[in-house]
Amino acid sequence: MRTEAQVPALQPPEPGLEGAMGHRTLVLPWVLLTLCVTAGTPEVWVQVRMEATELSSFTIRCGFLGSGSISLVTVSWGGPNGAGGTTLAVLHPERGIRQWAPARQARWETQSSISLILEGSGASSPCANTTFCCKFASFPEGSWEACGSLPPSSDPGLSAPPTPAPILRADLAGILGVSGVLLFGCVYLLHLLRRHKHRPAPRLQPSRTSPQAPRARAWAPSQASQAALHVPYATINTSCRPATLDTAHPHGGPSWWASLPTHAAHRPQGPAAWASTPIPARGSFVSVENGLYAQAGERPPHTGPGLTLFPDPRGPRAMEGPLGVR
């Protein structure tokens, strides 16, 4: 690439070569700059899987890929038999965690991911094609949602048991791979910009650097590296009841997260199941899967069982049940 970018001083270029090489020299930095900019765009991912050891149990993982701090996470699902959507859990980094049946255990895994386990039986249990949605809010930047459902191939009715672990590894590799490519691209863009700045302009093809290039140098790599660092997880387990849910257009989720359809679905409304009794969240754990959580020490603090998992300056009021529509 270096030899292509420079036109030899003593040798005239071949016809058409000058334009082609100059064009490549100018286009490549813009492509890389675009990648760097998009690397900083917040994304939400969702993974739904069924436990191989317990076919009545699902695992849903949600995470936020972005640089902002999370102010609230809401997990919802479409409900059985086409019923209207229902909130399963709400996680606030300071005010605590609230959850409703069939949710059994909601918790933070990292600063940017949560986990939720659902009851394995009961009339309100979700089905294999139930859609789960995770919405991450980062105040005041905004909020982002992604939805997912269990892949059809993992249907418990099938003879072959699901194999979630390889899928998870593949998705993880995809995320890390793309992040790595973006990071490398940004570094390479910096290298190109530095070369354009320090080397003498080619005699036949003067180099033109964009006025926006220095700004890209300043922040794009850090955005990419941040995106590479955020590979969070969240988990949900549930049992299955038949439900027919139509999918609509995606609102978010990394395109490389291919283990399941991420989509947001607009569904016909029916009676929503309003479970008014919150189930206390259990003690927390630190996932060290694949060594991803080296930054576990930065997560919100966890305490033992109870409704409010974080210190609440307002006292016992936080322990009361919901006063409103739930």
Partner: nanobody, 127 residues
Framework: EVQLVESGGGLVQPGGSLRLSCAAS????????MSWVRQAPGKGLEWVST????????SYVDSVKGRFTISRDNSKNTLYLQMNSLRAEDTAVYYC????????????????????WGQGTMVTVSS
Amino acid sequence: EVQLVESGGGLVQPGGSLRLSCAASGFTFSYYDMSWVRQAPGKGLEWVSTINSDGGRTSYVDSVKGRFTISRDNSKNTLYLQMNSLRAEDTAVYYCVEGDPHNFGLENLSLRDFGSWGQGTMVTVSS
């Protein structure tokens, strides 16, 4: 990205009516409880009303009961607040938010306590 855009605010005389709308996009609107909160000049954020995901249940702060009606149209991804018999004390910026503030208590409410929020629409009740 999630977007909530309020409209319908304005200047109205005491006893008058207004209908606020909130257009939602970027998320599965029908899955979430929605609320209206307001902030009067120089005051903190106050919860006004909440409606559940399918519109079957509603609740209101005492000061607006019988005067305000919250509703939603999930087919249009829109939340509404019909405000009748308006009073001077209803003057505030009204925000459309996702979530139920009762989840964590109504004290010291902040927009950061909700899953999504709009930019707000000003309602002024004055003669």
